[in-house]
């Protein structure tokens, strides 16, 4: 089973069914359909999946049977286009069905919605969930796949199978426990948080491929895998990068069966050749397939070889740099990136890519100059400010985080980003700033050598969320510019933005600052989101408000909520005290 297997199969659908097995086949088709038709009811998707599965079985029995030679896109697209309510539910997406493959699939991909208008998932009582799990385990787990896939249309499908396996294990264990809730709820919280993080990481991979092309993704992969596998040869890293690129291209393109199959092959290859790749893979390679693939993807960096020579001799001091570069530009730059990355597990991937880009730009300029060697001799000096910028930023922000704690650090970022891009919707600013703020608890605890790769690569994932949400309804030229100009310079671009002086403050609307007793029954997290939403709105009304003014208003607001939630007549308290608070805030901010 090599990379070009499909040529040998008369029926692609039969081939994938046999490779993956019925259970994974059905799960992946369900994920694919739910990621395309995000508004369709669960029962409709199950029906479509069952029809596809029955058809696949006929092809397994006889690969020459009618329609079995059709591509998966043709088969799945034809099936999706049988949905009766396509025009009413999806509007112009129905026009995709008039197209032929491959344009039809491209059309479906373009209509994936990163922020679908779907109700928030509310977690039922534990007993209710356990009853549903025991009554029909298969339906219960399919529902999980469906609900996650439709809300996260770029979720990495083979990884979602791993999440579903853990979800099932949690219910199997906890629904028999003495204290079901104490057992189950922390596991579900962990799966939810990990799932959101996994979705966001994959969304960046797909954006990288779709917006910046295969070369950009491959460069990212060379840098990351060279850090992770510093003992591996460049050709080994290159082979892994090629295969990984194929896997992610397939998943991001909606080819989930091929993606899952190729990911399994890649895990198999890595484990068969771990001696040439990394000493850290042993435990991963003893696990079953889904756990194995997940484990490999998260494996810690191997130790750096002890005797790595200086790079300056061959990449700067040598007179042959331009000759070598001219002979095979991408191989030479790939080697430079590999050599630099394996020596620097302490750098973020995006920093390594900035250094490689600087090196490439210098060679392009200098190799055409009269004295190339003289021209590129100082190229490594140009790296210093590029390295120091994220180092200083992380130092400052970790100090601020340690001083303020997560909630107040998020608030500082909310104010900072609302002033930078006040046109962005309040829910997006709250979501993105809250996630940016989580960098503190996630990364500042690490020693210096691990802070930058943790922080800056995490920030790249979060800022990509801003970029994909903003792309759906663009409102800020500054956001568009930072998102589209350079993938690796997104974070520095946003960091460099100052207060938007062109912004006309939002009209004051008392309704925005009217609160009710329902806030008292919210979880701490939901209450924080309410307060942070108010903070963004305040800044939109008064972008020139000082930190002190905003802090005073927010402190008053927190006291107001605490007071009214303790009152006997909460609703009356919120109505009366709320009016006073609005008036006092207006006065304090000069509104």
């Amino acid at each position: 089973r090599g990379v070009f297997r499909r040529d040998a199969h008369k029926s692609e659908v039969a081939h994938r069914f046999k490779d993956l097995g019925e259970e994974n086949f059905k799960a992946l088709v369900l994920i694919a359909f739910a990621q395309y038709l995000q508004q369709c009811p669960f029962e409709d998707h199950v029906k479509l999946v069952n029809e596809v599965t029955e058809f696949a079985k006929t092809c397994v029995a006889d690969e020459s049977a009618e329609n079995c030679d059709k591509s998966l896109h043709t088969l799945f697209g034809d099936k999706l286009c049988t949905v009766a309510t396509l025009r009413e539910t999806y509007g112009e997406m129905a026009d995709c069905c008039a197209k032929q493959e491959p344009e039809r699939n491209e059309c479906f991909l373009q209509h994936k919605d990163d922020n679908p208008n779907l109700p928030r998932l509310v977690r039922p009582e534990v007993d209710v969930m356990c009853t549903a799990f025991h009554d029909n385990e298969e339906t219960f787990l399919k529902k999980y796949l469906y609900e996650i896939a439709r809300r996260h249309p770029y979720f990495y499908a083979p990884e979602l199978l791993f999440f579903a396996k853990r979800y099932k294990a949690a219910f199997t264990e906890c629904c028999q426990a003495a204290d079901k809730a104490a057992c189950l709820l922390p596991k579900l919280d962990e799966l939810r948080d990990e799932g959101k993080a996994s979705s966001a990481k994959q969304r960046l991979k797909c954006a990288s491929l779709q917006k910046f092309g295969e070369r950009a993704f491959k460069a990212w992969a060379v840098a990351r895998l060279s850090q992770r596998f510093p003992k591996a040869e460049f050709a080994e890293v290159s082979k892994l990068v090629t295969d990984l690129t194929k896997v992610h291209t397939e998943c991001c393109h909606g080819d989930l069966l091929e993606c899952a199959d190729d990911r399994a092959d890649l895990a198999k290859y890595i484990c068969e050749n771990q001696d040439s790749i990394s000493s850290k893979l042993k435990e991963c390679c003893e696990k079953p397939l889904l756990e194995k693939s997940h484990c490999i993807a998260e494996v810690e960096n191997d130790e750096m070889p002890a005797d790595l020579p200086s790079l300056a001799a061959d990449f700067v001091e040598s007179k042959d740099v331009c000759k070598n570069y001219a002979e095979a530009k991408d191989v030479f730059l790939g080697m430079f990136l590999y050599e630099y990355a394996r020596r620097h597990p302490d750098y973020s991937v995006v920093l390594l890519l900035r250094l490689a880009k600087t090196y490439e730009t210098t060679l392009e300029k200098c190799c055409a100059a009269a004295d190339p060697h003289e021209c590129y001799a100082k190229v490594f000096d140009e790296f210093k400010p590029l390295v120091e910028e994220p180092q200083n930023l992380i130092k400052q922000n970790c100090e601020l985080f340690e001083q303020l704690g997560e909630y107040k650090f998020q608030n500082a970022l909310l104010v900072r980003y609302t002033k930078k891009v006040p046109q962005v919707s309040t829910p997006t600013l709250v979501e993105v700033s809250r996630n940016l703020g989580k960098v503190g608890s996630k990364c500042c605890k690490h020693p210096e050598a691990k802070r930058m790769p943790c922080a800056e690569d995490y920030l790249s994932v979060v800022l990509n969320q801003l970029c994909v949400l903003h792309e759906k309804t663009p409102v800020s030229d500054r956001v568009t510019k930072c998102c589209t100009e350079s993938l690796v310079n997104r974070r520095p671009c946003f960091s460099a933005l100052e207060v938007d002086e062109t912004y006309v403050p939002k009209e004051f609307n008392a309704e925005t600052f009217t609160f009710h007793a329902d806030i008292c029954t919210l979880s701490e997290k939901e209450r924080q989101i309410k307060k942070q939403t108010a903070l963004v709105e305040l800044v939109k009304h008064k972008p020139k408000a000082t930190k002190e003014q905003l802090k005073a208003v927010m402190d008053d607001f927190a006291a107001f909520v605490e007071k009214c939630c303790k009152a006997d007549d909460k609703e009356t308290c919120f109505a009366e005290e709320g009016k006073k608070l609005v008036a006092a805030s207006q006065a304090a901010l000069g509104l």
Epitope: E233, S238, S318, N324, M335, E339
Partner: nanobody, 125 residues
Framework: HVQLVESGGGSVQAGGSLRVSCVAS????????MGWFRQAPGKEREGVAS????????FYTNSVKGRFTISRDNAKNTVYLQMNSLQPEDTAMYYC??????????????????WGQGTQVTVSS
């Protein structure tokens, strides 16, 4: 066209040392991955050590780590293999090979494009 010429082989007692050399002519960046392979009678050819002549990174098969050292002198277009603490099982014909750094893998001789004629190393107990 790349030409590789090995020298320095010979016979030595167990525990002794030898240094073999490989001079490359017509070498380019796309043949800047240089390796040493060996083949004992009746056995498959196996990778011993490799070096990127641009970058200088080195790789070794497990059985020679700590005993053998590969190095280069780019000015002389020469790659060396210093072999210390030689054992009888190191007896083999030693071949120099060159290939593209994007393709060459020490565990796979087919990923190297150019080969020398070989030099015999014999270690007696």
């Amino acid at each position: 066209h790349v030409q590789l010429v090995e020298s320095g082989g010979g016979s030595v007692q167990a525990g002794g040392s030898l240094r073999v050399s490989c001079v490359a002519s017509g070498n380019t960046y796309l043949t800047s991955c240089m390796g040493w392979f060996r083949q004992a009678p009746g056995k498959e050819r196996e990778g011993v050590a490799s070096i990127y002549t641009v970058g200088g990174s080195t790789f070794y098969t497990n059985s020679v780590k700590g005993r053998f050292t590969i190095s280069r002198d780019n000015a002389k277009n020469t790659v060396y293999l210093q072999m210390n603490s030689l054992q009888p099982e190191d007896t083999a014909m030693y071949y120099c090979a060159a290939g593209s750094p994007a393709r060459c893998r020490l565990r796979d001789p087919t990923t190297f494009d150019y080969w020398g004629q070989g030099t015999q190393v014999t270690v007696s107990s």
